[in-house]
């Protein structure tokens, strides 16, 4: 499948997987904490304040690393899986803080959670640049 | 080697526009993040604003913020600061940096900078 | 937006002196903190990432630490080309900001 398309299936997933697990939390517009959201790069399920979130690498770099392997669980599609099994000392997960203030941004960044060959890259497929 | 070379700099009245452009050069411009950095006379480092790998995730200081405008053209590996309503407190050389991350992160290669100086 | 401040705004020492740079956030910003080094006329340089982790390239003198909302630049033993305005920066909310700055000039 077109990389494009994979990125445009998992956004639909995401919205669906956020709006079961808004359904399941009791989250509505006014409550406290942060709403879950697509951040053009994975799915963040919802979350109440103090409440750290971890995800595990997503597809866009199995596209970037075809050839990388994490030892950390592909969270499933149905839902948001358990992130209980992940652990941020795992390479390959990435974690938001929900805070008062709304969600913090990833940490690590995506490339040092994930893995990324600069050099290889140089030479690599170039069709992501216009992924959505 | 990474390189980034800004351009577009110059003197320019208090209100009127400005557009900074910066090309990048060995490495594969599309999958990174990009920055603006602004350094005033004599001053410290401000953070201005971010873009996303794919320009979809845009993010601003609250002293630019609607005045300014980050975008870039992976076609040309090309980055740009579209700065409307220019003030003398925007008087700075504006740097581009690298984001090591698709979607923000942190700055780890500079260009050398392009001068920006609001002025009547 | 979280504040960085610095101390202290300026270091006076010696070659082969010890260089201790503090950064403080106004609110936690976990272990999203960088440091970088900026000679006169230069481009800033990453140093140090994630609070402590070194980067190829640069000399094992400069080490980093700290959590949350303190932190702490060393430099082991100051090399004459040391000398220069370091800052920090948090990648962990938006908008991202730097701190003012540490000079580290030759007493």
């Known amino acids: 499948m077109h990389s494009d398309c994979i990125f445009k299936k998992e956004q639909a997933m995401c919205l669906e997987k956020i709006q079961r697990a808004n359904e399941l939390m009791g989250f509505n517009d006014s409550s406290p904490g942060c709403p879950g959201m697509w951040d053009n790069i994975t799915c963040w399920k919802p979350a109440h304040v103090g409440e750290m979130v971890l995800v595990s690498c997503p597809e866009l770099f199995r596209i970037f690393n075809p050839d990388q392997v994490w030892e950390t669980e592909t969270i499933g599609e149905s839902d948001f899986g358990d992130s209980n099994s992940l652990d941020l000392s795992d390479m390959g997960v990435v974690s938001r803080n929900c805070t008062e203030d709304g969600w913090s941004e990833p940490f690590p960044h995506y490339f040092d959670a994930c893995g990324f060959d600069e050099y290889e890259s140089e030479t690599g497929d170039q069709d992501y640049y216009y992924l959505s | 080697q990474v390189q980034l070379v800004e351009s577009g700099g110059g003197v320019v009245q208090p209100g009127r526009s400005l557009r900074l452009s910066c090309a990048a050069s060995?490495?594969?411009?599309?999958?990174?993040?990009m920055h603006w950095v602004r350094q005033a006379p004599g001053k410290g480092l401000e953070w201005v604003a971010v873009?996303?790998?794919?320009?979809?995730?845009?993010y601003y200081a609250r002293s630019v913020k609607g005045r300014f405008t980050i975008s870039r053209d992976n076609s040309k590996n090309t980055l740009y600061l579209q700065m409307n309503s220019l003030r003398a407190e925007d008087t700075a050389l504006f740097y581009c940096?690298?984001?090591?991350?698709?979607?923000?992160?942190?700055?780890?290669?500079w260009g050398q900078g392009t001068l920006v100086t609001v002025s009547s | 937006e979280i504040v960085l401040t610095q101390s202290p705004a300026t270091l006076s020492l010696s070659p082969g002196e010890r260089a201790t740079l503090s950064c403080r956030a106004s609110?936690?910003?976990?272990?999203?903190l960088h440091w970088y080094q900026q000679k006169p006329g230069q481009a800033p340089r990453l140093l140090i990432k994630?609070?402590?982790q070194s980067l190829s390239g640069i000399p094992a003198r400069f080490s980093g630490s700290g959590s949350g909302t303190d932190f702490t630049l060393t430099i082991s033993s100051l090399e004459p080309e040391d000398f220069a305005v370091y800052y920090c920066?948090?990648?962990?909310?938006?908008?991202?900001?730097f701190g003012p700055g540490t000079k580290v000039d030759i007493k």
């Open positions: 609110q936690s910003v976990g272990r999203s």
């Open positions: 873009i996303s790998y794919n320009g979809g995730n845009k």
């Open positions: 920066h948090q990648s962990s909310r938006l908008p991202f900001t």
């Open positions: 940096a690298r984001g090591y991350d698709v979607l923000t992160g942190y700055p780890d290669y």
């Open positions: 994630y609070a402590s």
């Open positions: 060995g490495f594969t411009f599309s999958r990174f993040a």
